[in-house]
């Protein structure tokens, strides 16, 4: 059946060295355990994280994300997942696309990650 993919409607903000969490879900909610689910940065070959066959498929990841991502899938049976990026870098800033694909249908949603310097402080006065 068909579905929509919904990401956050606002930029996700994270500090350098911290964690960022990018949520993504399908609507109407349905079990996504058997789907191919992932995040990529354009072009598609820059894979941030890929999940299929009930497992994270680390071999497909772009080298700069290896060992730094985790898919939170406790609610994947409801069609909800979150990508956690650890040890955030300035180079992680920018656009991300989350996609869900089943055997007959694929949809995706774009989202943005803003990375900020924890040591940069502007005097409000």
């Amino acid at each position: 059946g068909q579905f929509r993919v919904i990401g956050p409607g606002y930029p996700i903000r994270a500090l350098v060295g911290d964690e960022a969490e990018l949520p993504c879900r399908i609507s109407p909610g349905k079990n996504a355990t058997g789907m191919e689910v992932g995040w990529y940065r354009s072009p598609f070959s820059r894979v941030v994280h890929l999940y299929r066959n009930g497992k994270d498929q680390d071999a497909e990841q772009a080298p700069e994300y290896r060992g730094r991502t985790e898919l939170l899938k406790e609610t994947i049976s409801e069609g909800k997942v979150t990508l956690r990026i650890q040890n955030v870098r300035f180079s992680d800033e920018g656009g991300y696309t989350c996609f869900f694909r089943d055997h007959s249908y694929q949809e995706e949603a774009a989202m943005e990650l803003k990375v900020e310097d924890p040591f940069y402080w502007v005097n409000p006065g």
């Epitope: 191919e36 992932g38 072009p43 598609f44 070959s45 299929r52 009930g54 055997h103 694929q106």
Partner: antibody, heavy 121, light 108 residues
């Protein structure tokens, strides 16, 4: 309508080379992994190789690793299989198959009609 | 590599019969299994994926079941068009796949 049309098969001597092509239409070619599956005369199906939608990841059966190379040209909607150091046991009908996934190997929802490769002296 | 074993190799049946084909995996593959039908001189056709999901356009007399290591393809009422060879395929391995040796369904 999805269509896959293989070409390039024929008779080749042992140790020789051949390049198979598969022209695809009716779907967004670059969004799907593609595979080659072969079937020796009177035998069952054997998966040979696969390639991700972008072409960035390739996968091979042990029986052809180091001898066969899969590639794709997404601007031409075409899949290729370069076969080197051919052996008699490579004789088969070679099918091009569309996968449902973007990466790796899943199940194949569309198949070409096949092209026959005969390796014989 | 995961080995797939089908039984029987050949099955003789009549139109209207209920037909069951079994596929066993050498290790657990969860529900990552597909079934195909192939007629002589033709390409295989996908019938079932994820062990029990019917591919679009496939008649409802075909059904699949099972998980782990044992799977079945059932044709509830065999039709003349169903005489063919059937293959199972494991899709658990992600970066490779293997097929069963095939089951030929012939006219009794």
């Amino acid at each position: 309508e999805v269509q896959l049309l293989e070409s390039g098969g024929g008779l080749v001597q042992p140790g020789g080379s051949l390049r198979l092509s598969c022209a695809a239409s009716g779907f967004t070619f670059s969004s799907y992994a593609m595979s080659w599956v072969r079937q020796a005369p009177g035998k069952g199906l054997e998966w040979v190789s696969a390639i991700s939608g972008s072409g960035g990841s390739t996968y091979y059966a042990d029986s052809v690793k180091g001898r066969f190379t899969i590639s794709r040209d997404n601007s031409k909607n075409t899949l290729y299989l370069q076969m080197n150091s051919l052996r008699a046991e490579d004789t088969a009908v070679y099918y091009c198959a569309k996968d449902w996934v973007y990466f790796g190997v899943g199940s194949f929802d569309y198949w070409g009609q096949g092209t026959l490769v005969t390796v014989s002296s | 590599d995961i080995q797939m074993t089908q039984s029987p190799s050949t099955l003789s049946a009549s139109v209207g019969d209920r037909v069951t084909i079994t596929c066993r995996a050498s290790q657990s593959i969860s529900s990552w299994l597909a079934w195909y039908q192939q007629k002589p001189g033709k390409a295989p056709k996908l019938l079932i994926y994820d062990a029990s999901s019917l591919e679009s356009g496939v008649p409802s007399r075909f059904s699949g079941s099972g998980s782990g290591t044992e799977f079945t393809l059932t044709i509830s009422s065999l039709q003349p068009d169903d005489f063919a060879t059937y293959y199972c395929q494991q899709t658990h391995s992600y970066s490779s796949t293997t097929f069963g040796q095939g089951t030929k369904v012939e006219i009794k």
